[in-house]
């Protein structure tokens, strides 16, 4: 290009469809210059124009020769340029922000602009830069890139930005520019100019204000507070901690809190002070709701479902900021909300959901929501398998007969489609409780009935009941206890009977024991005693309870005595016993000793004894008839332990073992014995029958049985030199070598001669008796031998 000719040809495009080419005019040319621009392409095109630029349709790929001829007063000049797409710059039009708005409550800016995509021939990627500035001094706060695509039509774009500082605190400015990253264009691509700036500001009134107000944020977050003030702010505190002031426009200030701590339930105070005033806001720092823990749904009545859960980690947010819960059932689309007034019981929350007709499977989602977030738990439940029945109420007991009762109770709910397993606790006084399980068909009307058999007549029972469903989820709580006395029945057995002849042998005394309650089957009112022989039966008058003895004058013929117990319902079977004993000539008296509390008696099996054995016992020192008590044991027994509260150690008892056949008893063994042997309480009385110069003859008496207190096993006789009323040691003092002891084990021996003594010498004699229970006290005597003749 010659100097003085058009030069510096440059082309730009803003839409890829039209190139705007411009050049510099030759030096020295004035306004009146015309140009002829010729473009060498398929068809040679020339354009006449009066300005130094030309808009031409975009040229396809390749080099093009552009000739610019300038025609002016003092001649013409021509320049030739080679033009290629690569020499063209793509500079988008300056964008325009259509709208900038703000949500002050969330400190969010909303931006809206048009990409003017309709002027572009192809789809292209666009990069937008959005610049956010703050304060009158327009400090850059944020530079953001935002990607969109041109799609051949004008598209509105929206973008939002949440400010870390409340928007009320300072004016905020926004500008945008764009860069079109077209794959179809090989030239230079450049950023557009920045759009005209738009701003958002809060219109303060004359009042001082602190922002944000009542904000709820996550523990650990950063947050900025500001005070919009006409007066100078002196200090700012969060809680009791002073914070450095960040100066904004005018007297306005801000503070930035990093990693905020959890708030108390009343929130955390943020306070700004001026010379004369104090201004505050409250921040609530807490947590989003934890996933509800241990979500469990069950029903008490198949009418409503009770769902319980534990809220998990505390959110530290209360009142209107507390977690709200919604229970959604997905099959039905029904939901219920947890009311905050329903305060949690023992840390767990609960909600009731009305059951739906013909729906057994429920898919529950429990949504937890607070200002910081949400969470959920899900549970799929077949509600017929999750029945936790109410406590049975109106529990009643009615008699059916003496061994059966009818139990009725109320269990609210509609259980027509399920079966119950109910557990009945049956407790007799002073016995182990019994539990019986019964299966009952569920009903709609809540009333239940069950019969209970195999009970004892005239027995006080305590009943209670609890129920679960047959598929078992949980037992209900136990009902109240009901005490009930079953009705009377005929006594099931005759009384345990014995007989003894009176001491003069003229009367037969019949004894019987009161029937145990489980055999009496009611209150025994009286007894009938009758006496029968082959010829006749004689009945005694009715004997009222509690008399358990009757006396009949009988001869020595054999009679069968019958005793019958009667209650209000009827009479027991008779107890029969023969008046006469079956003789037994082959009897020895044996000795037996017990084991402290009782006495073990054993015998050989005797197949002849067909009804039972009777052991009777009495205190051997008592007068006839000898009867203290008796015990019946079955005929297949060969031993028994006799125990009685009346047994005392050191007391001698007689025991008699009888065998029974055909209601007649034969004495099989006669025993004397002690439950426990003790030492004798007295010493034997002894006398000196004869003395000589070298011997003494001693004689003693038996100790009475009551004072013996055991079986006598022998005597201990001590003797040694000694005088009455002297300081010489007594015979039984230990350490004396001259004392002699004789152990007399022949208990029939009643005399003892002591020989080889010295004449005219005083001897101290001591006598003691002993049993297996110990040695008794001593009896002593002083004797002087005669002089040697």
């Amino acid at each position: 290009q010659k100097k003085g000719a058009p030069h510096d040809l440059k082309c730009v495009t803003n839409n890829l469809q039209v190139w705007d080419c411009y050049w510099k005019a030759p030096s020295g040319t004035g306004r009146g210059t015309d140009y002829e621009v010729c473009i060498e392409n398929r068809s040679h095109s020339c354009y006449q124009l009066e300005k130094t630029n030309i808009k031409i349709p975009a040229l396809s790929h390749g080099d093009y020769e552009i000739t610019i001829n300038s025609l002016h007063d003092f001649g013409s000049s021509t320049s030739k340029f080679t033009l290629n797409e690569q020499n063209v710059s793509l500079i988008p039009d300056t964008p325009e922000i259509l709208n900038l708005s703000a949500d002050f409550s969330t400190s969010t800016l909303y931006l809206k602009w048009n990409d003017r995509g309709s002027v572009f021939p192809h789809h292209s990627n666009v990069i937008w830069e959005i610049k956010i500035l703050r304060k009158e001094s327009m400090e850059l706060v944020k530079l953001v890139t935002h990607n969109t695509t041109l799609n051949g039509k004008d598209t509105l774009h929206h973008w939002s930005w949440a400010s870390d500082m409340p928007l009320e605190c300072a004016i905020h400015f926004v500008e945008i520019r764009c860069y079109i990253d077209s794959l179809h264009f090989s030239g230079r691509k450049e950023w557009s100019d920045w759009s005209p700036v738009k701003n958002i500001s809060w219109m303060p009134d004359s009042q001082t204000k602190v922002f944000p107000q009542d904000k709820v944020i996550l523990v650990g977050s950063d947050i900025t507070f500001c005070c919009i003030s006409q007066e100078k702010v002196l200090s700012a505190l969060i809680g009791h901690t002073n914070c450095p002031l960040i100066h904004l426009d005018g007297e306005n200030v801000a503070i930035k809190i990093h990693n905020i701590s959890v708030s108390a339930s009343s929130g955390t105070n943020v306070v700004f002070t001026t010379e004369d005033n104090i201004f505050g806001t409250v921040i609530f720092a807490g947590y989003p709701p934890d996933t509800p823990q241990q979500l469990n749904c069950e029903t008490h009545d198949l009418k409503e479902i009770l769902c319980r859960w534990n809220p998990g980690r505390a959110t530290a947010l209360v009142g209107p900021r507390a977690t709200s819960y919604t229970l959604l059932e997905s099959f039905s689309g029904k939901y219920v909300r947890f009311k905050r007034a329903e305060a949690p019981t023992n840390g767990s929350y609960q909600l009731f959901f009305q059951m739906l007709p013909n729906q057994e499977i429920y898919n529950f989602t429990l949504n937890a929501h607070n200002p910081l977030g949400r969470s959920e738990s899900t549970i799929l439940v077949n509600i017929t398998e999750k029945v936790y029945p109410h406590t049975p109420t109106s529990f009643k007991v009615k008699d059916i007969n003496s061994t059966a009762v009818k139990l009725s109770w109320h269990l609210p709910g509609n259980f027509a489609k399920i079966n119950f397993l109910c557990q009945i606790e049956i407790k007799k006084s002073n016995t182990v409780q019994e539990q019986r399980n019964v299966t009952i068909k569920g009903v709609e009307n809540s009333s239940y009935l069950v019969a209970l058999d195999k009970l004892n007549p005239y027995t006080v029972y305590t009943f209670r009941i609890r129920c679960s469903t047959e598929t078992f989820w949980k037992w209900s709580k136990w009902s109240n206890k009901k005490q009930h006395l079953t009705t009377e029945a005929i006594p099931s057995k005759g009384p345990d009977t014995w007989r003894e002849w009176s001491s003069d042998g003229k009367n037969l005394i019949i004894y019987w024991k009161p029937l145990p309650i489980n055999e009496a089957n009611g209150k025994i009112l009286s007894y009938n005693v009758s006496c029968s022989s082959d010829e006749e039966t004689q009945s005694l008058s009715e004997i009222p309870d509690p008399q358990h003895k009757a006396e009949i004058q009988l001869d020595k013929n054999d009679y069968i005595i019958s005793v019958v117990a009667k209650n209000s319902v009827g009479s027991s079977p008779p107890s029969k016993i023969a008046s006469m004993e079956i003789p037994n000539d082959d009897l020895k008296i044996e000795q037996v000793v017990g084991m402290g509390k009782g006495i073990l008696l054993t015998w050989h099996y005797d197949p002849n004894m067909t009804c039972d054995y009777v052991i009777k016992w009495c205190n051997s020192s008592r007068s006839e008839p000898c009867l203290m008590d008796w015990r019946k044991v079955p005929s297949n027994s060969t031993e028994t332990v006799i125990e009685s509260d009346q047994f005392r150690p050191g007391v001698r008892y007689n025991f008699f073992l009888y065998g029974c056949r055909n209601q007649g008893y034969q004495l099989l063994r006669s025993m004397i014995g002690y439950i426990e042997e003790l030492a004798p309480t007295v010493a034997p009385n002894f006398t000196v029958e004869d003395t000589s110069a070298d011997s003494i003859l001693v004689k003693w008496e038996d100790i009475p049985v009551e004072e013996l207190r055991g079986f006598l096993r022998g005597y201990l006789f001590y003797f040694g030199k000694g005088e009455r009323d002297t300081s010489k040691m007594r015979v039984l003092e230990s350490g004396r070598s001259d004392i002699k002891v004789k152990n007399i084990t022949d208990i029939s021996q009643k005399t003892l001669r002591i020989a080889d003594l010295q004449g005219k010498t005083s001897y101290h004699l001591v006598l003691r008796a002993y049993t297996d229970g110990g040695v008794g006290p001593e009896k002593s005597m002083y004797v002087v031998t005669k002089e040697n003749s």
């Epitope: 204000k209 107000q213 009542d214 009343s266 002070t273 104090i278 505050g280 806001t281 409250v282 009142g319």
Partner: antibody
């Protein structure tokens, strides 16, 4: 139990001074902000002044600023209100009141004394 | 300063009735800083509600508070004979702390 007992009220001429005291007991006085609130005869409540728990800051109603001074002696568990340049419109029952929250700065008033009457009259 | 207005000035109701008392602020008040007090003749005020909705210790649950921004309400669900008194609202979020003029609840 918390007790606040005001004293020092009485009849005073306009332009003169008066000092009210409030004896506190039953709580940790040094941990609570304290306020004075007044009530003119037959009228509503008017907040007068507040002092922080540690005495570091004091704030006043516009109507008394520059004339009244609130102070406290934490060792004596006592709150004071020094009233200078009294005016007829200062005639009221003056209540001292404790702020609800332990150690907090902006608090509702949960315990009040029975009040002491100040009459400003010539 | 923040001006609080209360309405109605007087509320005449029967025991067992429901009382709804209104408090309006001249500018937005943080709900955390709004309280209600009850005052009976010859007695000091008594704190009922703080933080707009939290009941003070020992206050029966027939008293409840609600509201935010500039409009707040105190509700007494079933008036008992001892509830007839004057009720004041107070903002304590920015000084000067201000009270409303009070609402007198008297027996109809």
């Amino acid at each position: 139990q918390v007790q606040l007992v005001e004293s020092g009220g009485g009849v005073v001429q306009p332009g003169r001074s008066l000092r009210l005291s409030c004896a506190a007991s039953g709580f940790t006085f040094s941990s609570y902000g304290m306020d004075w609130v007044r009530q003119a005869p037959g009228k509503g409540l008017e907040w007068v002044a507040v002092i922080w728990y540690d005495g570091s800051n004091k704030f006043y109603a516009d109507s008394v600023r520059g004339r009244f001074t609130i102070s406290r002696d934490n060792s004596q568990n006592t709150l004071y209100l020094q009233m200078n340049s009294l005016r007829a419109e200062d005639t009221a029952v003056y209540y001292c009141a404790r702020e609800l929250w332990f150690g907090e700065l902006l608090s509702p008033l949960d315990f009040w004394g029975q009040g002491t009457l100040v009459t400003v009259s010539s | 300063e923040i001006v609080l207005t209360q309405s109605p000035g007087t509320l005449s109701l029967s025991p067992g009735g429901r009382a709804t008392l209104s408090c309006r602020a001249s500018q937005s008040v943080s709900s955390s800083y709004l309280a209600w007090y009850q005052q009976k003749p010859g007695q000091a005020p008594r704190l009922l509600i703080y933080g707009a909705s939290s009941r003070a210790t020992g206050i029966p649950d027939r008293f409840s508070g609600s509201g935010s921004g500039t409009d707040f309400t105190l509700t007494i669900s079933r008036l008992e004979p001892e509830d007839f008194a004057v009720y004041y609202c107070q903002q304590y979020g920015s000084s000067p702390f201000t009270f409303g003029p009070g609402i007198k609840v008297d027996i109809k």
